[in-house]
Amino acid sequence: MEDEKPKVNPKLYMCVCEGLSCGNEDHCEGQQCFSSLSINDGFHVYQKGCFQVYEQGKMTCKTPPSPGQAVECCQGDWCNRNITAQLPTKGKSFPGTQNFHLE
């Protein structure tokens, strides 16, 4: 489809970077920013970062959240700063539902 083809000169965005792939940097530059949550042995591991090339994020960003993984993507400078990926509530599989709250 036409709208899924990468642009010749794609716009790059500054993204917050937090996680295993960030090294000592707290930001990265890419075509999309993301915020993710994965469950590792029952522990919540939150990460933020960027997809530097279009194809990298294309499939990941379209994957609906599962009980063990959720990714939310956005385009815009620092757009992932205030996004926290959330797991779906039982029986649902879309972003924006929360399985937990803080007490």
Epitope: E18, I39, D41, F43, P67, F100
Partner: antibody, heavy 118, light 106 residues
Framework: EVQLVESGGGLVQPGGSLRLSCAAS????????MYWIRQAPGKGLEWISS????????YYPDSVKGRFTISRDNSKNTVYLQMNSLRAEDTAVYYC???????????WGQGTLVTVSS | DIQMTQSPSSLSASVGDRVTITCKAS??????LNWFQQKPGKAPKLLIY???SLQTGVPSRFSGSGSGTDFTLTISSLQPEDFATYYC????????FGQGTKVEIK
């Protein structure tokens, strides 16, 4: 106030079984993952199991996989640890713990002692 | 599995001393690390989460730092109630604790 109270510990022979319970109060139990951690006498801490909010996903290290089973009853605000084929090296204080999503193992129970000996 | 190596395994210090405990991970764990304090016969108590965030109710003399493989717990001015054993814990993958550091009275 968050409270976690373990029970069910005791003396058991090698090869035997035991079921530990952890009664939770002071928070919405069904919203939280729960965990068991153990500590052998005079030794360090070892994570041994986790369970998700509805009990559908469970996690174990290789040291107890196939012998221990974690489960929960959200109607009773209780998490369990069924321990089978117990060995001398399973002798430990067993702690129940809870996390919030961004603060792992924020709260712990007082522990219950399991002794495996003939 | 990721190995967590704490040092020293024990130390002697006096009230008012600045105490530093280190924890080294065998591979990159970013900031997915907590510090716990344990006193004899008691359950561990969370002090620091996500490498450097102070748990609610924990005195500000405790602080944590580090990212990747090297982490530090610092007690800026040791108090009588701080004599205990301290453990680091990583949850990046295959959750593991360090072997502990016992802080004793000099």
């Amino acid at each position: 106030e968050v409270q976690l109270v373990e029970s069910g510990g005791g003396l058991v022979q090698p090869g035997g079984s035991l079921r530990l319970s952890c009664a939770a109060s002071g928070f919405t139990f069904s919203n939280y993952y729960m965990y068991w951690i153990r500590q052998a006498p005079g030794k360090g801490l070892e994570w041994i199991s986790s369970i998700n909010t509805d009990g559908g996903s469970t996690y174990y290290p290789d040291s107890v996989k196939g012998r221990f089973t974690i489960s929960r009853d959200n109607s009773k605000n209780t998490v369990y640890l069924q321990m089978n084929s117990l060995r001398a090296e399973d002798t430990a204080v067993y702690y129940c713990a809870k996390s919030t999503p961004n603060i792992p193992l924020a709260y712990w129970g007082q522990g219950t002692l399991v002794t495996v000996s003939s | 599995d990721i190995q967590m190596t704490q040092s020293p395994s024990s130390l002697s210090a006096s009230v008012g001393d600045r105490v530093t405990i280190t924890c080294k991970a065998s591979q990159n764990i970013y900031k997915y690390l907590n510090w716990f304090q344990q006193k004899p016969g008691k359950a561990p108590k969370l002090l620091i989460y996500y490498s450097n965030s102070l748990q609610t109710g924990v005195p500000s003399r405790f602080s944590g730092s580090g990212s990747g493989t090297d982490f530090t717990l610092t007690i800026s001015s040791l108090q009588p109630e701080d004599f205990a054993t301290y453990y680091c814990f990583q949850y990046s993958s295959g959750p593991t604790f360090g072997q502990g550091t016992k802080v004793e009275i000099k």
